[in-house]
């Protein structure tokens, strides 16, 4: 079985951990894709997850939570936005293939929230006070709400993950700029 | 354009082998399931099974799992329906059909079907 | 396996009505049914998935409604290319059965 192996992002409450999981084009471009939660001792849990089919540059928001999928980069883009420290867990994004067990998409994430340094409330130009300004997806996704560990497997890409703040702008003219490794084939 | 072929119409007598065809065409063959069922004259719809041409991963319905053998052969972009033994009850219109992109149990493209006639 | 039961077996309305059909399933499948269409001498085609979302290329008058073991087919305004078997399908349990369909006839 493949290692499971994970990358650490030390976040402060109220910033956006902004991930960018990499899959092949051709075969997952439409393929639902979810955003889980593994806590010890637990099946992995789904926080969210895109349309069935998925749709291209189709922001799904769940909560602090917001998903797009860009079918011509091959990358599934996550949001979680205004952090808490509750947030602190281990994450994985994967996709939904039935009915094939789904494919995990990148080494899974360790997220650690802590607090942000003392003062105004608002003052840190990472914190999230403002209504975030994606608008949230009407359509209502059916996702999956397990998936068995033992049968999720690995795929070699990491993902691109990076910190910041609520205004910052879609941009995804650098997409080349990632690190473009196939995921399956 | 996306499309399955199936074989021609077969007539043949209990007890004797067969093998059906579908090919795929338009389409990246390995990366979508392949299913098949079945449809009695005047009858209803049976789901018998499907496969993954990419890793010959096959599913079977208990009612005909050992009864029949689904295969494909992906360097010709084709899936196989078999049967070893013949019987009358057999005599059936078979489709075969392709899973979706991102959802190999649902069906988008359906072949034009092969009749298969058992009569001694 | 799961039991797929369809009613009306038979459906006799004119063109411009509303059909209603409606498909049980013998133990909850979420939302994971599919509804498909088959003409005379034709294969079957895709028109519901995930109880209520149309496939592509369906047109508007087809809808599908209902969750757990309770599903229904509706066409709000029969044309005349509507007149068919319906069948239901679920495929959230192995195998993915389907129901008995029902036949929708011109009366």
């Known amino acids: 079985a493949t290692k499971l192996t994970e990358e650490k992002y030390e976040l402060k409450e109220g910033q956006t951990l902004d991930v960018k999981c990499d899959y092949t084009l051709e075969k997952f471009a439409s393929s639902q894709k979810a955003w889980q939660i593994i806590r010890d001792g637990e099946m992995p849990k789904t926080l969210a997850c895109t349309e069935r089919p998925s749709k291209n540059s189709h922001p799904v928001q769940v909560g602090r939570i917001i998903l797009e999928d860009y079918h011509d980069h091959g990358l599934l883009r996550v949001r979680m936005v205004n952090l808490q420290v509750e947030d602190s867990g281990l994450y994985q994004c994967v996709i939904y293939q039935p009915p094939k067990e789904p494919h995990m998409l990148f080494d899974r994430i360790r997220l650690v929230v802590t607090k942000g340094f003392s003062g105004t409330p608002g003052s840190n130009e990472n914190s999230t006070q403002n209504v975030y300004k994606i608008p949230p997806t009407t359509t209502k996704a059916l996702c999956p709400l397990y998936t068995s560990p033992r049968t999720v497997t690995q795929a070699p890409p990491k993902s691109t993950a990076d910190v910041s703040t609520p205004d910052s702008e879609i941009n995804l003219t650098n997409v080349t700029d990632i690190i473009r490794v196939p995921v399956f084939n | 354009e996306v499309q399955l072929v199936q074989s021609g119409a077969e007539v043949k007598k209990p007890g004797e082998s067969l093998k059906i065809s579908c090919k795929g065409s338009?389409?990246?063959?390995?990366?979508?399931?392949i299913g098949w069922v079945r449809q009695m004259p005047g009858k209803g719809l049976e789901w018998m099974g499907i496969?993954?041409?990419?890793?010959?991963?096959?599913r079977y319905s208990p009612s005909f799992q050992g009864q029949v053998t689904i295969s494909a052969d992906k360097s010709i972009s084709t899936a196989y329906l078999q049967w070893s033994s013949l019987k009358a009850s057999d005599t059936a219109m078979y489709y075969c059909?392709?899973?979706?992109?991102?959802?190999?149990?649902?069906?988008?493209?359906w072949g034009q079907g092969t009749m298969v006639t058992v009569s001694s | 396996e799961i039991v797929l039961t369809q009613s009306p077996a038979t459906l006799s309305l004119s063109p411009g009505e509303r059909a209603t059909l409606s498909c049980r399933a013998s133990?909850?499948?979420?939302?994971?049914l599919a509804w498909y269409q088959q003409k005379p001498g034709q294969a079957p085609r895709l028109l519901i998935y995930?109880?209520?979302n149309r496939a592509t290329g369906i047109p508007a008058r087809f809808s599908g409604s209902g969750s757990g073991t309770d599903f229904t087919l509706t066409i709000s305004s029969l044309e005349p290319e509507d007149f068919a078997v319906y069948y239901c399908?679920?495929?959230?349990?192995?195998?993915?059965?389907f129901g008995g369909g029902t036949k929708v006839e011109i009366k």
């Open positions: 496969i993954y041409p990419g890793d010959s991963d096959t």
């Open positions: 399908q679920q495929f959230d349990n192995l195998p993915y059965t």
């Open positions: 059909a392709r899973g979706s992109p991102w959802d190999g149990r649902l069906f988008d493209i």
């Open positions: 338009g389409y990246s063959f390995t990366t979508y399931w």
């Open positions: 995930d109880a209520s």
């Open positions: 133990q909850s499948v979420s939302s994971y």
